[in-house]
């Protein structure tokens, strides 16, 4: 999906008012310096592409983020503010249902959510120069 035509300010507002705290709660008990940010993004569409990938695509060691509350809210926000997103995701969801995993919090998942927090921070500050 091409995130170019999303309403970025509406997504930012949704993140600040409904998603950010759930990411923090998921990470509770871990130090903010525990994980290095290794995933970056260059602009808002790119950030959303990376956020979508890290949130919904199972990875080695962390197969369960898609069923977390922050993921559900992310899915809902993208569907509302990214034209055509819901249509493109319907087929993908049917495939996902066949391999849905039980929610398990692993160290790898914590690292992945830490990366997500960094991507969201970058999304919210689009005018900053890339480090």
């Amino acid at each position: 999906y091409d995130f170019t035509n999303c309403d970025f300010e509406k997504i930012k507002a949704a993140y600040l008012s409904t998603i950010s705290k759930d990411l923090i709660t998921y990470m509770s008990g871990t130090k903010s310096t525990e994980f290095n940010n290794t995933v970056s993004c260059s602009n808002r569409p790119h950030c959303l592409t990376e956020i979508q990938s890290l949130t919904f695509n199972p990875t080695a060691g962390c197969a369960s983020l898609a069923k977390e509350m922050f993921a559900m809210k992310t899915k809902a926000a993208l569907a509302i503010w990214c034209p055509g997103y819901s249509e493109t995701q319907i087929n993908a969801t049917q495939a996902m249902k066949k391999r849905r995993k039980r929610k398990v919090t692993t160290n790898k998942c914590l690292e992945q959510v830490s990366q997500l927090q960094g991507l969201w921070r970058r999304f919210n500050r689009p005018l900053l120069k890339q480090q």
């Epitope: 409904t18 998603i19 809902a76 319907i90």
Partner: antibody, heavy 117, light 107 residues
Framework: QVQLVESGGGLVQPGGSLRLSCAAS????????MSWVRQAPGKGLEWVSG???????YYAGSVKGRFTISRDNSKNTLYLQMNSLRAEDTAVYYC???????????WGQGTLVTVSS | DIELTQPPSVSVAPGQTARISCGGD??????VYWYQQKPGQAPVLVIY???KRPSGIPERFSGSNSGNTATLTISGTQAEDEADYYC??????????FGGGTKLTVL
């Protein structure tokens, strides 16, 4: 303007079935997470069920296995199929738009379901 | 999973400040929303994201949430604020949960 209009409520005997409908207008229905919330007479609000744009569903424990939520995005309509109805299911049923799988920003006017012999 | 506890009733004199509490285990780690419901009407969202007001909701409505308690505050309460108020949050099992409701009486 944004509107949700429920229909299908009425009197039904215990063990019976009923299907509620909710017609949505004024917004892109196919993009939103939608829910049903009920309120027994003189009681508080109880969330019943919700459904994503892609058909992914969630249920309260009290109705799981008896109620089925569905949607027809081409008709901008939300449904609630209620089977094996009990007296405690008597309530006003509200159709609701649940913003971001989160808070309810739009409510219908409600439809009364009475389960009694 | 989380249960939300509200006082059944709160009374306030016109022009005074009304505070309605909503308690739940580690509630501060979740978002809380507040609804106003008047007799015979559907509920109306008055606070979302702990403390944000939807457009059209008067400034006298405010919210906070920390620890195990969320609070809806109505400053300079008016007669028209008399209603039932419900808090709402969510569970780890991805379901929506409401408090039992608080009847606000403006004396």
């Amino acid at each position: 303007q944004v509107q949700l209009v429920e229909s299908g409520g009425g009197l039904v005997q215990p063990g019976g079935s009923l299907r509620l409908s909710c017609a949505a207008s004024g917004f892109t229905f196919s993009s939103y997470y939608m829910s049903w919330v009920r309120q027994a007479p003189g009681k508080g609000l109880e969330w019943v069920s919700g459904i994503f744009f892609d058909g992914e569903t969630y249920y309260a424990g009290s109705v799981k296995g008896r109620f089925t939520i569905s949607r027809d995005n081409s008709k901008n309509t939300l449904y609630l199929q209620m089977n094996s109805l009990r007296a405690e299911d008597t309530a006003v049923y509200y159709c609701a738009r649940q913003q971001y799988f989160d808070h309810i920003d739009i409510w219908g006017q409600g439809t009364l379901v009475t389960v009694s012999s | 999973d989380i249960e939300l506890t509200q006082p059944p009733s709160v009374s306030v004199a016109p022009g005074q400040t009304a505070r309605i509490s909503c308690g739940g285990d580690s509630l501060g780690g979740k978002y809380v929303y507040w609804y106003q419901q008047k007799p015979g009407q559907a509920p109306v969202l008055v606070i979302y994201g702990d403390s944000k007001r939807p457009s059209g909701i008067p400034e006298r409505f405010s919210g906070s949430n920390s620890g195990n308690t969320a609070t809806l505050t109505i400053s300079g309460t008016q007669a028209e604020d008399e209603a039932d108020y419900y808090c709402q949050s969510y569970t780890n099992a991805l379901s929506t949960v409401f408090g039992g409701g608080t009847k606000l009486t403006v004396l």
